[in-house]
């Protein structure tokens, strides 16, 4: 589909650079051919990244803000293209490339899971919640008995270093816990984390990574969960988790246990009660959880299971017998 | 209640320099990220920088990078700007503002009643 | 440039409804991004009004109300008063900015007598 031609000779970018311009990310900046003659014509770019990850788009700008881990280094490449006649003619490629970081592999950490939660906020008289942010990871099998590890996160423009760490047996950071972020619980960016370490011995490779709010947000469970029996009907109410997220955006799992016969029943619902018909010779235990709908982010976690809540007569009534 | 004063400005040359200030009282400055919005004569607002509540992470706005700095001293529940290279076009009003982010896009809920800072020769 | 877009002005009568809009784009609000709203009374410094879309601080009136939709929100005001006479930012989120903070350029909103 790319067709030389010769009466339009296109020339591929000037200038191309990678420049670093935050955690797990990056700017890449060209300048059109000096020596292209075409001027008049609407000439695009094509920007290919060969690594990490594969991936190409077009743009008419002459610069491209990308999201991405750098530990492995980084790789691309822009042309110059021009639509023309149903065709596309393209320029031979300009490349640029970061090198991965120093370090041996296995001196960086490994399992890096992060988590984030939303908690009542004692200061905001506005917005009542705060969210907070807690990753672990293990130490990498290669590094030094010395080496120290240190966390940085990224949210949008905001990059803050740890201050709050959990140590092994050997005083090695191996976990961190931000109690208050500038993570947008209800937004839409990559929560990018960096875990970087130093030893006298060697250098310690940094490790990157990025995460999707919705896949790692922990979800509290539903509030004030009541249940109660009236005759052959149990009645379950509750009030939506401590989040950011409003009213209508839940998707609610209520469990009902049947403590005499061991049945359970596990209901999905959009609303904030249940009405289930029983047998009132049971006792019962309920529980409710709760999941952001996909109405409102993308499919995420379930919460843990609310506290159980006991109803019903507590003596076991032999079944009748005929 | 919380309380936002701003002082410092002044007039001063192209290419001077001048540091705001802004004291807080009401409410626990060390818990809460600040911010420096201005307001240019007759014109709208303009979001200038912000700072982390423990004053080590900073943002600024593509027009004031390299030349204004955004500090705090949280001992004096003290938020200040270090303004270098001024330029005619950095003639405003310049209020202080908490940050507020929690979980969202962030707002500045209270407000000083700004100090005048005008660059001219 | 990127930026949240106001009419400059709107005027309207004691008593009577007026809205004032904030148009955006796909990189602030057309991506979900919350939506907040200040007034600005002549000679003193501006005043959280609306946050997150259609949130009142305490203190502020319910004739104020706001509202989003695609890529714009607007600010509802009923019964119109003489001291809602002000000037009116709206203010949002843009991830194709180094700060992420955008305002509106304001609206001036003028009580008729």
């Known amino acids: 589909d790319l067709l030389p031609d010769d009466k339009i000779s296109l020339l591929p970018p000037v200038n191309f650079t990678i420049k670093v311009t935050g955690l797990a990310q990056v700017l890449l900046r060209w300048e059109p051919n000096p020596d292209q003659e075409q001027r008049n014509v609407n000439l695009e770019y094509q920007v290919k990244i060969n690594a990490p990850k594969e991936d190409d788009y077009e743009t008419r700008i002459t610069e491209s803000k990308c999201v991405t881990i750098l530990h492995k280094g980084f790789s691309a490449s822009v042309r110059t293209i021009l639509q023309k006649d149903h065709s596309l003619l393209a320029s031979s490629w300009a490349s640029a490339e970061l090198h991965a970081p120093p370090g041996s592999p296995g001196t960086s950490v490994v399992n890096l899971t992060c988590t984030t939660n939303t908690t009542a906020d004692n200061y905001s008289y506005l917005r009542p919640y705060q969210v907070s942010l807690h990753c672990t990871w293990l130490v990498g099998t290669d590094a030094p008995e010395d080496t120290q590890y240190f966390l940085y996160y990224r949210y949008g423009s905001w990059t803050e270093e740890c201050q709050e760490y959990s140590k092994d047996s050997m005083g090695r950071n191996i976990a961190c816990w931000f109690p208050r972020t500038f993570i947008h619980s209800r937004g839409r960016d990559w929560l990018a984390v960096l875990v970087n370490g130093s030893s006298k011995h060697s250098a310690i490779k940094p490790f990157d990574q990025l995460f999707a709010l919705h896949a790692i947000d922990q979800i509290n469970p539903p509030l004030n969960v009541t249940a109660e029996i009236k005759g052959t009907r149990l009645s379950i109410q509750w009030e939506k988790p401590v989040s950011a997220f409003p009213i209508h955006c839940f998707d609610y799992e209520v469990k009902i246990h049947n403590a005499r016969n061991g049945y359970l029943q596990i209901e999905k619902m959009m609303t904030n009660a249940f009405i289930s018909i029983i047998d009132d010779l049971s006792k019962y235990d309920v529980q409710v959880r709760a999941a952001v709908s996909s109405m409102c982010r993308e499919a995420g976690l379930w919460s843990e299971w609310s506290q159980p809540i006991y109803v019903g007569k507590d003596e076991h009534k032999p079944l009748r017998q005929w | 209640q919380v309380q936002l004063q701003e002082s410092g400005g002044g007039l001063v040359q192209p290419g001077g320099s001048l540091r705001l200030s802004c004291a807080a009282s009401?409410?626990?400055?060390?818990?809460?990220?600040m911010s420096w919005v201005r307001q240019a004569p007759g014109k709208g607002l303009e979001w200038v920088s912000a700072?982390?509540?423990?004053?080590?992470?900073?943002n600024y706005a593509d027009s004031v990078k390299g030349r204004f700095t955004i500090s705090r001293d949280n001992a004096k529940n003290t938020l200040y700007l270090q303004m270098n290279s001024l330029r005619a076009e950095d003639t405003a009003v310049y209020y202080c503002?908490?940050?507020?982010?929690?979980?969202?896009?962030?707002?500045?809920?209270?407000w000083g009643q700004g100090t005048m800072v005008t660059v001219s020769s | 440039q990127a930026g949240l877009t106001q009419p400059p002005s709107v005027s309207a009568a004691p008593g009577q409804r007026v809205t004032i809009s904030c148009s955006g784009s796909?990189?602030?609000?057309?991506?979900?991004?919350?939506v907040h709203w200040y007034q600005q009374v002549p000679g003193t410094a501006p005043k959280l009004l609306i946050f997150?879309?259609?949130n009142r601080p305490s203190g502020v009136p319910d004739r104020f109300s706001g509202s989003k939709s695609g890529t714009s929100a607007s600010l509802a005001i009923t019964g119109l008063q003489a001291e809602d006479e002000a000037d009116y930012y709206c203010?949002?989120?843009?991830?194709?900015?180094?700060?992420?903070?955008?305002f509106g350029g304001g609206t001036k909103l003028t009580v008729l007598r």
């Open positions: 796909r990189s602030n609000i057309g991506s979900g991004y919350d």
């Open positions: 997150d879309d259609n």
């Open positions: 700072i982390n509540s423990g004053g080590k992470s900073t």
């Open positions: 009401g409410f626990t400055f060390s818990n809460y990220a």
């Open positions: 503002a908490d940050y507020a982010t929690n979980y969202g896009v962030p707002y500045f809920g209270s």
């Open positions: 203010q949002s989120y843009d991830s194709s900015l180094s700060g992420h903070v955008v």
